[in-house]
Interface confidence: low
């Protein structure tokens, strides 16, 4: 039966969904165990204009000391202001100094990185040390780099589509998920749902993704569903500040019981399925419907409160 | 809701100053980004300048045809944007609109008239 | 500097008629974003980013291209619609609007 439920986007005012990811829309990750230098290269895009960036490089310790030293080339389209951190990481940074501004002195070494295309700074990288990680990302807010994390199974770093970079990089979008909403027609009352839909990844190791729910309204004033839906490999760890109805795939804790794993349900893998999912549970809003690359952490806010549902 | 309130315009003579200021409420003013943009009677939109965040340094940016003579500063304890407008020509007539960039200009005030004119 | 040219420069039409707005850049621009102005009354932002319709803009306004060449488009003029529109790109340093076009009721 089609569920009469036409998803329409929601202003920012009443729903946002900001996220973190390890997919990149081209990348690598290869193992060089014995080099004395760990290069890595970003491929940063930034669409509209001057951007401002967080970038944070992050040790994983071996023995107490990070016995490597870095090299991360950065390759930007258009002017970025760089908020860098990397604490005690022996690193050289090759970039373009007229498209790379720093909000504090680095305090590292810098090269210039000659204004080549992707393919010959790859080359120019590899020359200087085996290619540990290189990413390419579209309009990036912040992104977190773990040096010695690569467990990629290729010993040559070669950029290919889709690709999961694991735990060597996670990183944010600037632009907010679109999140959608409607009426569910025939249904009476004020429950709402909202719905979060993971696609999968392209890497099918299991996953937990933390979900962060913060609804703007009295606790009494709500009455909500939180319907989860993604890949069999991922659970939920959800972070919410309200007591709500949980609807998920996989299995889900509570981030202040984590070590309660909760058995979830089979549940349907299409828009329509998922509305007709949160018809069976008596919503007549939803007031969120997003859908996702796999995350690893997805922040919703939003202040419908069961009230009437605005969209752009 | 996001409000930007332009004032300062007004008559000057070629060669004088003005300053204008941008009144903000209703969002972090220190976190944003504002720019000033100008638009000549009868003509099209044309930008003038950019200061950015604190997070930024505040650095400014200018268009070539301003530079070196207007200036564009923030008090983010009032919550104000200023444009310090110095050596005015006749060209500079326009009405100034002071706005916010969020990956576009996403609001804007209702705009305050400067006349250079002798 | 990119030089956005738009056209038409003013644009005659009735209630109900499609119209199409282009916007030509000298070179190759990541995204477009469009302005709507009225007589007296400062811009308001009304396509983002190429395609995405600003806040409260009605669903009849779309807007495509890449590249170079970008187009806003009214499925159906209504009598609000009347007004100019901008394009603004900031792909590159400095940013830069287009000369506008003044969609006229005919």
């Known amino acids: 039966e089609t569920v009469h439920c036409d998803l329409q986007p929601v202003g920012p005012e009443r729903g946002e969904v900001t996220y973190t990811t390890s997919q990149v829309s081209k990348g690598c990750v290869a193992q060089a165990p014995n080099a004395i230098l760990e290069v890595h290269v970003l491929f940063l895009e930034f669409p509209t204009g001057p951007s401002q960036l967080e970038l944070t490089l992050q040790a994983s310790k071996q023995n107490g000391t990070w016995p490597r030293e870095v090299l991360l080339v950065l390759s930007v389209n258009s002017s970025v202001f760089l908020h860098l951190q990397a604490l005690g990481i022996p690193l050289h940074l090759a970039y373009n100094s007229s498209l790379v501004t720093f909000q504090e002195p680095p305090g590292v070494n810098t090269t210039e990185l000659p204004s080549f295309p992707k393919t010959q700074i790859l080359e120019w990288a590899a020359e200087r040390g085996p290619i540990t990680s290189a990413a390419e990302l579209n309009d990036p807010q912040s992104i977190l780099l773990r040096l010695g994390q690569a467990q990629g199974s290729l010993s040559f770093c070669m950029l290919e589509a889709s690709q999961d970079m694991g735990r060597t990089l996670e990183w944010r979008p600037r632009t907010p998920a679109l999140v959608r909403g409607c009426h569910l027609e025939g249904v009476a009352g004020h429950k709402e749902a909202h719905i979060l839909r993971v696609l999968p990844g392209h890497s099918a190791g299991p996953r937990t993704v933390t979900v962060k729910v913060e609804l703007s309204c009295a606790p009494g004033d709500l009455d909500a569903v939180l319907i989860l839906q993604g890949p069999p490999y991922v659970s939920w760890l959800i972070d919410a500040n309200h007591n709500m109805q949980i609807w998920t795939t996989g299995e889900y804790s509570f981030k202040i019981f984590p070590e309660k794993n909760i058995r979830g349900f089979k549940l349907p893998d299409t828009p329509q399925g998922l509305l007709g999912e949160a018809r069976m549970l008596n919503a007549s809003i939803v007031a969120s419907f997003v859908e996702l690359p796999l995350a690893s952490i997805v922040s919703l806010h939003a202040s419908s409160c069961g009230g009437r549902l605005q969209t752009s | 809701e996001v409000q930007l309130v332009e004032s300062g315009g007004g008559l000057v003579k070629p060669g004088g100053s003005l300053r204008l200021s941008c009144a903000a409420s209703?969002?972090?003013?220190?976190?944003?980004?504002m720019d000033w943009v100008r638009q000549a009677p009868g003509k099209g939109l044309e930008w003038v300048g950019e200061?950015?965040?604190?997070?930024?340094?505040?650095?400014?940016y200018y268009a070539e045809s301003v530079k070196g003579r207007f200036t564009i500063s923030r008090d983010d304890s009032k919550n104000t944007l200023y444009l310090q407008m110095n050596s005015l020509k006749t060209e500079d007539t326009a009405v100034y609109y002071c706005?916010?960039?969020?990956?576009?200009?996403?609001?804007w005030g209702q705009g305050t008239l400067v006349t250079v004119s002798s | 500097d990119i030089q956005l040219t738009q056209s038409p420069s003013s644009l005659s039409a009735s209630v109900g008629d499609r119209a199409t707005i282009t916007c030509r850049a000298s070179?190759?621009?990541?995204?477009m974003h469009w302005y709507q102005q009225k007589p007296g009354k400062a811009p308001k932002p009304w396509i983002y980013?190429?395609?995405n319709l600003a806040s409260g803009v009605p669903s009849r306004f779309s807007g495509s291209g890449s590249g170079t060449d970008y187009t806003l488009t009214i499925s159906s003029l209504q009598p609000e619609d009347f007004a100019t529109y901008y394009c603004?790109?900031?792909?590159?340093?400095?940013?830069?609007f287009g000369g506008g076009t003044k969609v006229e009721i005919k």
């Open positions: 200061i950015r965040s604190r997070a930024s340094n505040h650095a400014t």
């Open positions: 209703g969002f972090t003013f220190s976190d944003a980004w």
């Open positions: 603004q790109q900031w792909s590159s340093n400095p940013l830069t």
């Open positions: 706005t916010r960039w969020r990956r576009f200009f996403d609001s």
């Open positions: 980013a190429s395609s």
């Open positions: 070179s190759s621009v990541s995204y």
